[in-house]
């Protein structure tokens, strides 16, 4: 099977949202854990992450053959403690299957603003006063 | 054993909110889907939505989108089902369910008990 | 959205003879499909999954046939107990949908 994994970020107000998406049959769901890292470039795990998330052992219907599975990642307030490398992953704790998505980084500006690079999906925009910039 | 035990009756009037709970024991409640399912006196069964608790996402028909909200707690393995704007015609008894997993149960293998919504002014 | 058509609406049986029920879809789905049973006053009960698959408990002269978008619930030797409402729902996509129902009464 084919399992992929995306990172995005969204930005309601002063909260921002860093999103893991991970695509992946039905039947491969078991077992699997998603999971977002901080500066973590090479021991990412779902110990050393900032949150984790089992992936649907059931998509709820029966007439699907790929299905989405998000973990969702709020910052409330963007501050200097934000910035960093992030990176989306997988494991499976059942074939040992391992998926690392590419590195995304905070930056924190002088001003007050911030900047999320890396998200090559994502479109540019631009915000003001402590409201970041999605490149 | 499975148990899914809901909230009492409740009386409303119309334009009010009412807040239905439904509490999950004797299994993993993270991984089944919570499906709520209303039943008007004398009609048929009616699919509201469902919510996932592993991860919150929620699913429901058309009719409902805007004015039902779906939640879970997992802390104590117990699903809402919020319900907003109420008119006459929500009148029901409200069924929890909880559908099996996939390839293996697939229909809503345990439900509620129910709770009686009477919306009269 | 999925339509499921059950006919008929009501189906006057004697205790003893065999009931067959439908249900239609608006568009395949597969074998997605699942049978319940309701009495007055009482929740739904999950008799049939998957079309045709038996679930634990339920007696066996309830069973379960079709694929596709026809669908049969049969009960081939009606006992006392089993007149009541009988309805198909679909887990093939969402929203997930139910049919309007079948009332199997003594005759």
């Known amino acids: 099977g084919c399992i992929n994994i995306t990172s995005s970020a969204s930005q309601e107000g002063t909260r921002l949202n860093l999103i893991c998406t991970v695509w992946h049959k039905k039947e491969e769901a078991e077992g699997f854990v998603v999971f977002l890292c901080k500066d973590r470039s090479g021991d990412c795990s779902p110990e050393t992450s900032l949150k984790q998330l089992r992936l649907k052992r059931d998509p709820g219907i029966d007439g699907v053959g790929e299905i989405s599975s998000q973990l969702m990642f709020t910052i409330s307030q963007v501050t200097p403690l934000h910035s960093g490398t992030y990176q989306c992953c997988a494991r499976s704790q059942k074939s040992g299957i391992r998926l690392q998505g590419h590195f995304f980084s905070i930056l924190f500006t002088e001003t007050g603003n911030y900047t999320v690079t890396g998200l090559k999906q994502r479109q540019h925009l631009e915000f003001s006063h402590n409201e970041g910039t999605l490149s | 054993q499975v148990q899914l035990v809901q909230s009492g009756a409740e009386v409303k009037k119309p334009g009010a909110s009412v807040k239905v709970s439904c509490k999950a024991s004797?299994?993993?409640?993270?991984?089944?889907?919570m499906q709520w399912i209303r039943q008007a006196p004398g009609q048929g069964l009616e699919w509201i939505g469902a919510?996932?608790?592993?991860?919150?996402?929620?699913q429901f028909t058309q009719k409902f989108r805007g004015r039902a909200t779906l939640t879970a707690d997992k802390s104590t393995s117990t699903a809402y089902m919020e319900l907003s704007s109420l008119r006459s015609e929500d009148t029901a008894v409200y069924y929890c369910a909880r559908r099996g997993i996939a390839a293996v149960v697939g229909g809503f293998d345990y439900w509620g008990q129910g709770t009686t919504l009477t919306v009269s002014s | 959205e999925i339509v499921l058509t059950q006919s008929p609406a009501t189906l006057s049986l004697s205790p003893g003879e065999r009931a067959t029920l439908s249900c239609r879809a608006s568009q395949s789905i597969s074998n997605h499909l699942h049978w319940y049973q309701q009495k007055p006053g009482q929740a739904p009960r999950l008799l049939i999954k998957?079309?045709?698959q038996s679930i634990s408990g339920i007696p066996a002269r309830f069973s379960g046939s079709g694929s596709g978008t026809d669908f049969t619930l049969t009960i081939s030797s009606l006992e006392p107990e089993d007149f009541a409402v009988y309805f198909c729902q679909q887990s093939n996509s969402w929203p997930l949908t139910f049919g309007g129902g079948t009332k199997v009464e003594i005759k």
């Open positions: 998957y079309a045709s």
């Open positions: 004797g299994y993993t409640f993270t991984d089944y889907w």
């Open positions: 919510i996932y608790p592993g991860d919150d996402d929620a």
